[in-house]
């Protein structure tokens, strides 16, 4: 009896694991083995696929084959007993295109009201993702073990901290990876659970803000108790993307070590241009708080988000305001290459009733003014990026009198 070729061959690639599955064509024939050949693009000869020769089951693993994952390959399979079936050719494929991202490895650390999630690729030193290691982003689903209400968090990197949790509570989460450049979404990790600790005696500092004064940065925060000492640390923000490395080398800000006030001042030249994370910790000499929430700090935005400069053209019933780039010392304009929104506040000089206009444009009309009346105007700039939500201080108020009636043409 002629052996029939196997059918429905499926190629599953997860990370660097290459698995083949197929159906037997004839279940009634026993002791059949199966063998695969492969062919690379541009080659005429077929090569035996190691790991997939004389297989008795309907599954084999050819992960040991060192393939160029960006190169198209073709497979064929046949059944063997005393004689052999004809070859069944599988549609050619490119391993990288076919590959799925496997479940990432997840490690958890618990605090009283926070969990730190360390994520690394499931396959260490993967060949499949060798060129994409730094491009992985992750998303996670987290829930309280007791409630099951899920919260999704998208676009996180290899270290992520979730705040505002409840003490002594078990949280569960699962994580999956994505390579957005290749439109690939991975499979979820197994569920990991961890219990937050008892509430710490000292809470972490809150509401950390950075501002610029002269040539210095001023870092301020709030704290519940008096007579504390604080320390501040920084980290390059890009280091949170570092896959597989669980050591984050937070550095002290020298002028912010063991400070006894809820603020510290340090020179702008402490930081080169870049995006940093900052965190603050409190201590009373015996106990130490956990670290505060980490805030993102962009030196370019921080240093150069100066109040806008503007000119006013006065009409009888309106002001035309022309916003220009703020001036640095030396009267050179600051180039701000990120989108800004302008907040303009104006009021009648004899009144405290302020009105507000929010505008993206740099020429703004303030309407519905009374003729021959003194109005004052001040303005500030906001960044449009919600992750780097920064605002300049207000400009000094400029007061102008509107023109007499009928000059609005």
């Amino acid at each position: 009896k002629n052996l029939k070729s196997p059918q429905k061959v499926e190629v599953d690639i997860i990370d660097d694991n290459f698995i083949l599955r197929w159906n037997r064509s004839d279940e009634s024939v026993g002791n059949v083995t199966f063998s695969f050949d492969y062919q690379k693009t541009g080659m005429d000869n077929w090569i035996k696929l190691s790991g997939c020769q004389n297989i008795t089951s309907t599954k084999c693993n050819f992960s040991s084959l060192k393939l160029n994952v960006y190169e198209e390959i073709k497979l064929r399979i046949r059944a063997e007993k005393e004689n052999t079936s004809s070859w069944y050719e599988v549609d050619s494929f490119t391993p990288f295109r076919k590959a799925q991202i496997g479940p990432p490895e997840v490690h958890l650390e618990a605090e009283d009201k926070a969990i730190v999630i360390h994520i690394s690729p499931g396959t260490k030193d993967s060949v499949m993702w060798a060129l994409d290691g730094l491009s992985f982003t992750y998303s996670l689903v987290i829930w309280k073990n007791s409630s099951g209400v899920e919260e999704r968090i998208e676009n996180i990197y290899s270290r992520h901290k979730i705040y505002k949790l409840s003490p002594e509570t078990t949280y569960c989460l699962k994580v999956k990876a994505a390579l957005l450049t290749s439109w690939k979404i991975g499979v979820y990790s197994p569920v990991h659970c961890i219990k937050t600790t008892v509430e710490n005696e000292l809470p972490p500092p809150e509401n950390i803000e950075v501002s610029v004064q002269n040539q210095n940065y001023v870092l301020k925060w709030d704290y519940t108790y008096a007579n504390m000492t604080f320390q501040v640390q920084w980290l390059h923000a890009f280091l949170k993307r570092n896959p597989g490395n669980h050591l984050y080398k937070w550095k002290q800000i020298p002028d912010c070590e063991n400070v006894k006030t809820t603020q510290c001042v340090f020179p702008q030249n402490v930081f080169q241009k870049g995006i940093y994370l900052l965190r603050v910790q409190a201590s009373d000499g015996n106990n130490t708080s956990f670290w505060s929430e980490e805030i993102k700090f962009d030196t370019e935005i921080q240093a150069f988000l100066l109040p806008p400069v503007f000119n006013i053209r006065s009409l009888s019933d309106s002001f035309h305001i022309y916003i220009g780039a703020p001036k640095q010392s030396g009267n050179t304009p600051v180039i701000q290459d990120y989108p800004l929104i302008y907040e303009i506040i104006f009021w009648e000089n004899t009144s405290n009733a302020e009105r507000k206009i929010i505008e993206k444009k740099t020429d703004v009309t303030v309407p519905n003014l009374k003729p021959l009346t003194v109005y004052c105007v001040k303005a500030r700039a906001h960044t449009m990026d919600e992750k780097l939500n920064k605002s300049s201080v207000f400009s000094d108020a400029v007061c102008e009198k509107t023109k007499p009636g009928n000059t609005s043409k």
């Epitope: 360390h118 710490n200 490395n245 669980h246 050591l247 002290q252």
Partner: antibody, heavy 118, light 107 residues
């Protein structure tokens, strides 16, 4: 294979100084912290301090401030512990260990025995 | 400084038994606790990090648990080669500190 190879045993006189070395293989010390730990005979482990070999930043236990100086040479992938003004209290085995953050001190050297005696 | 207290200096157990070594921190250290095993005449060997994660190559009869201030290393199905001293360590705050150690004796 990750290894930390420490320098040989030292017999030194009171008041003198000694410099111990810890040479790493199988990894780059710049990617980790290197810690030093003291253990006196039949006693527990005492943390001395650590260095970030990338920039030389150090942290010390208050007890060892002024006694211990930790340095590193990234070109030879080696960390050092210098102990000064030695007394019999400094007689101990000193270990270096690699520290990987979350993963703590995952690899240890074999230890260097320091004996302070006149 | 954070004090790590291993109240039992010695523990006696038999092959095949289950034993728990405890460690108490003087303040909340989250889950930043590691356990090390030191056999006579050898350097310490890392067993557990981040309270409950085993290093690769460590037999699964070693498990870590706890959080905050109370931590436990459990050895189930104790083997003769587990005769050693066990140290806990916190690495949440500088200076990092070790427990005094618990010596495991095999009956």
């Amino acid at each position: 294979e990750v290894q930390l190879q420490q320098s040989g045993a030292e017999l030194v006189k009171p008041g003198a100084s000694v410099k111990l070395s810890c040479t790493a293989s199988g990894f780059n010390i710049k990617d980790y912290y290197i810690h030093w730990v003291k253990q006196r005979t039949e006693q527990g482990l005492e943390w001395i301090g650590r260095i970030d070999p990338e920039d030389g930043e150090t942290k010390y236990a208050p007890k060892f401030q002024g006694k211990a100086t930790i340095t590193a040479d990234t070109s030879s992938n080696t960390a050092y512990l210098q102990l000064s003004s030695l007394t019999s209290e400094d007689t101990a085995v000193y270990y270096c260990a690699r520290f990987g953050g979350l993963t703590a001190m995952d690899y240890w050297g074999q230890g260097t025995s320091v004996t302070v005696s006149s | 400084d954070i004090v790590m207290t291993q109240s039992q200096k010695f523990m006696s157990t038999s092959v095949g038994d289950r034993v728990s070594v405890t460690c108490k921190a003087s303040q909340n250290v989250g889950t930043n606790v590691a356990w090390y095993q030191q056999k006579p005449g050898q350097s310490p060997k890392a067993l557990i990090y981040a309270t409950s994660y085993r290093y690769s190559g460590v037999p699964d009869r070693f498990t870590g648990s706890g959080s905050g201030t109370d931590f436990t290393l459990t050895i189930s199905n104790v083997q003769s080669e587990d005769l050693a001293e066990y140290f806990c360590q916190q690495y949440n705050n500088y200076p990092y500190t070790f427990g005094g150690g618990t010596k495991l004796e095999i009956k």
